[in-house]
Interface confidence: medium
Amino acid sequence: LPAQVAFTPYAPEPGGTCRLREYYDQTAQMCCSKCPPGQHAKVFCTKTSDTVCDSCEDSTYTQLWNWVPECLSCGSRCSSDQVETQACTREQNRICTCRPGWYCALSKQEGCRLCAQLRKCRPGFGVARPGTETSDVVCKPCAPGTFSNTTSSTDICRPHQICHVVAIPGNASMDAVCTSTSPTRSMAPGAVHLPQPVSTRSQHTQPTPAPSTAPGTSFLLPVGPSPPAEGSTGD
């Protein structure tokens, strides 16, 4: 940078990079100011005037220092199978995450685009791998000596009770029935009951996709001036 240059806009050395929170405008051939989060470029810079920034309108945002001509639209309201974990502000998009008992089947850059209800393991099957925010439950058949008599997204296969005298033998979906009054419970390793979700649903409903939002990267790639060189981005 020539020593006499200090304030935007200024012409960098050819091939030189602009400073932090500045971008190189190919048309003006100048290093110009970026706009702060919550604002956008109302007027692009010229050889003699710097970028003019303006606040984002309601329901729009910019999250980074930028020079986009328009702020990005916040995503539409969260669907019924989602919870709003971050509100739409001038500086951040709305983030929707899945309700308890649901997982994200199709994620987006932030939050979830499509939630699906966690799989319920039917009787005779137990949870082999619990559901997470982004993965479904994996069920497995109950091994000999274990059972599950519930339709659940959390219950694992539990060991049959051990009877002194068996009235009805247990199977994969039913516990053993004893004739004696004091059955003992086998302490098989891993025989732990997983906690129930906060809310459960009695019937399976079809998941509804969350409406698409503008891709989160677009505030780095405006249609107007060129993106800055590597090393001159960031804030």
């Epitope: 012409a11 050819p14 091939g15 190189y24 190919q26 048309t27 050889k47 060129s226 993106p227 590597e230």
Partner: antibody
């Protein structure tokens, strides 16, 4: 290191078309505009125009509107200059050059000869 | 369009001498003038940008001055490798234009 490598010399007949390529390497292609400059044999430099390498929007000098087209393939960091309906006075060396304000890197030039 | 007029068309000097090349713009171009050197069979090479800023790697014997319409490229002590054609160019307004060139030859 930064390089602009142009396609090889072309010999064309009048009325034909030619497309010159300019492959950039060593820097972020979409940061700097790409200028095109013509130099007829024994003559000076003529600025043909430039293309905004992020948006792909070209700007042409008046003498180069109509038959000339600047395009990009950003996936390969390549700029193109196409010239249609070639005439004998289009015979020249065509340069691609990075930037507009102080053009700091130039291609080696592509000689286009138009001869019947 | 802005016309850039260079003078003289040819300058004959000896190594060690001082060369002064002139470039006049038909309109005010502020300081948006660059100077280029071109040798036969080669692409132009950037020497000066912004009227007076020496580009990276260019020897200190090259200097540029001027603003508005009158610009000068000075080579303080000519070296054998400096004999070439020199062009000024403006990038203030479209269409960008070059001067017709000054040929610096050995006397």
């Amino acid at each position: 290191q930064i390089q602009l490598v142009q396609s090889g010399a072309e010999v064309k007949k009048p009325g034909a078309s030619v497309k010159v390529s300019c492959k950039a390497s060593g820097y972020t292609f979409t940061t700097y505009g790409m200028s095109w400059v013509r130099q007829a044999p024994g003559q000076g430099l003529e600025w043909m125009g430039w293309i905004h390498t992020y948006s792909g929007v070209p700007t042409y000098a008046d003498d180069f509107k109509g038959r000339f087209a600047f395009t990009l393939d950003t996936s390969t960091s390549t700029a193109y200059m196409e010239l249609r309906s070639l005439r004998s006075d289009d015979t020249a060396v065509y340069y691609c050059a990075r930037g507009l304000y102080g053009v700091d890197y130039w291609g080696q030039g592509t000689l286009v000869t138009v001869s019947s | 369009e802005i016309v850039m007029t260079q003078s003289p068309a040819t300058l004959s000097l000896s190594p060690g001498e001082r060369a002064t090349l002139s470039c006049k713009a038909s309109e005010n171009v502020v300081t948006y003038v660059s100077w280029y050197q071109q040798k036969p069979g080669q692409a132009p090479r950037l020497l000066i940008y912004g009227a007076s800023n020496r580009y990276t790697g260019i020897p200190a014997r090259f200097s540029g001055s001027g603003s508005a319409t009158d610009f000068t490229l000075t080579i303080s002590s000519l070296q054998p490798e400096d004999f070439a054609v020199y062009y000024c160019g403006q990038s203030y307004t479209y269409p960008y234009t070059f001067g017709q060139g000054t040929k610096l030859e050995i006397k």
